[in-house]
């Protein structure tokens, strides 16, 4: 029996559905009853879904697991994880075994879009060339960690006097909070940019200082 | 008749290596996983490691991964275990095991063992 | 992982029926087949039973297994001098814990 899994990682979002694919090449005349699928954690071996002795023995990780109960004797032994968290992600392996025996490991890369950023602006009045700004862009409830960039109004990147803070949540999202220092010219825009390096999503804010008033 | 004899036990100080050799004879022998289980002197049967036909993977007790490496040579009808790093607690007798038709059915051929001694 | 609990001595005289218990059959992957294996004084262990009942040829009907809940039993009867050996139950718990044998039981025939 020879195990097969995608190569590639399976990206899922949070609270989504992911199937973990999984298949092996049954023998002709091949039964359930022969049968024995084990889904586990590949680097803390816990059991995470199984199917022996004819079976379907459910899930054992959260409740959250399924199998694909009539394509199994198709030789498709793919994993349903349902309302995926932060938490799941890593590394599963599929184990087959009937006559022979083998296995293969799948990961799980877990993400999330960031929200449009907030910008924020201190001080926000009786602005003067010349003075001492401090922009915030804030940006929430996204996964993996986000990358930050930020540039002028002629796409110029902002480097210096740039402070980034990313703090996960009880769902392990991150709120990241990026604080850019400037001295201001006659005018100009400042524009940040969220980016999720999994999803490849880019979340962009911008505030533009033209005197008064100010626009977002 | 189906056949496993097993070869390359002795004495080994710690820390020491040893390579165990289990020559098959009398079925298919690339059509079957292949076993090694231990058994210290007046104490119970201990399972070691498995390997699938193909010997692409492979499985360990977790005394002895990271030290023990199980592989075969199905143009020889050979499976190996390779035991680096041994302890006291590695002596042992050393059987070999086929597997019946299904592999979670159990291990219906058995070598007569080989002997491990580890000790300074 | 699984831990299989078998007394570690059991006895009887020629010609009567003896019962070895395994307990401790709960595996966290489902499975409930259990295995048993012979071991004379000496030599290498034998497959006695699989998947709780079933005999390989060449072993005797003497030779028996059942399981209820977590349990699993091995009977011998007509119990012959020749029995006298070491038993072990076994049970496979996949990927997990490998195979998991149990503590042995040494049979003793007075």
């Known amino acids: 029996v020879e195990v097969q899994v995608s190569e590639d990682p399976v990206v899922a979002l949070v609270d989504t559905d992911a199937t973990l694919r999984c298949s092996f090449s049954p023998e002709p005349g091949f039964s359930l009853a022969q049968l024995n699928l084990i889904w586990q954690l590949t680097d803390t071996k816990q059991l995470v879904h199984s199917f022996t002795e004819g079976r379907d023995q459910g899930s054992a990780y959260s409740n959250r697991t399924a199998l694909f109960p009539d394509l199994l004797v198709q030789g498709n032994a793919s994993l349903r994880l349902q309302r995926v968290r932060v938490t799941d992600e890593g590394s599963y392996t599929c184990f087959v075994s009937i006559q022979d025996f083998d296995s293969a490991a799948v990961s799980l890369q877990v993400a999330a879009p960031y929200s449009k950023p907030s910008m924020t602006l201190e001080p926000n009045k009786d602005l003067r060339p010349g003075n001492m700004v401090t922009i915030t862009c804030s940006s929430y409830q996204g996964y993996p960690e986000a990358e930050v960039f930020w540039k002028d109004g002629q796409g110029v990147p902002l480097t210096g006097n740039v402070t980034t803070s990313q703090m996960a949540n009880e769902r392990g999202l991150f709120d990241v909070h990026s604080v850019l220092r400037v001295v201001l010219g006659a005018n100009g825009t400042y524009s940040c940019l969220v980016r999720n390096p999994v999803l490849q999503q880019d979340a962009h804010g911008s505030v533009t200082i033209t005197g008064q008033p100010l626009t977002f | 008749e189906v056949q496993l004899l097993e070869s390359g036990g002795g004495l080994v100080q710690p820390g020491g290596s040893l390579r165990l050799s289990c020559a098959a004879s009398?079925?298919?022998?690339?059509?079957?996983?292949m076993t090694w289980v231990r058994q210290a002197p007046g104490k119970g049967l201990e399972w070691v490691a498995d390997?699938?036909?193909?010997?692409?993977?492979?499985l360990y007790a977790d005394a002895v991964k990271g030290r023990f490496t199980i592989s075969r040579d199905n143009s020889k009808n050979i499976v190996y275990l390779q035991m680096n790093s041994l302890r006291g607690e590695d002596t042992a007798v050393y059987y070999c095991?086929?597997?019946?038709?299904?592999?979670?059915?159990?291990?219906?051929?058995w070598g007569q063992g080989t002997t491990v001694t580890v000790s300074s | 992982q699984s831990v299989l609990t078998q007394p570690p001595s059991a006895s009887g005289t020629p010609g009567q029926r003896v019962t070895i218990s395994c307990s401790g059959v709960t595996s966290k992957i489902g499975s409930k087949y259990v295995h048993w294996y012979q071991q004379l004084p000496g030599t290498a262990p034998k497959l006695l039973i699989y998947?709780?009942?079933e005999r390989p040829s060449g072993v005797p009907d003497r030779f028996s297994g059942s399981t209820s809940g977590t349990s699993a039993s091995l009977a011998i009867s007509g119990l012959q001098s020749e029995d006298e050996a070491d038993y072990y139950c076994a049970t496979w718990e996949g990927a997990l814990n490998g195979w998991v044998f149990g503590g042995g039981t040494k049979l003793t025939v007075l």
């Open positions: 998947r709780n009942f």
């Open positions: 095991a086929k597997h019946l038709d299904y592999y979670s059915y159990g291990m219906d051929v």
């Open positions: 009398g079925f298919t022998f690339s059509s079957y996983p």
């Open positions: 390997i699938n036909s193909g010997g692409g993977t492979t």
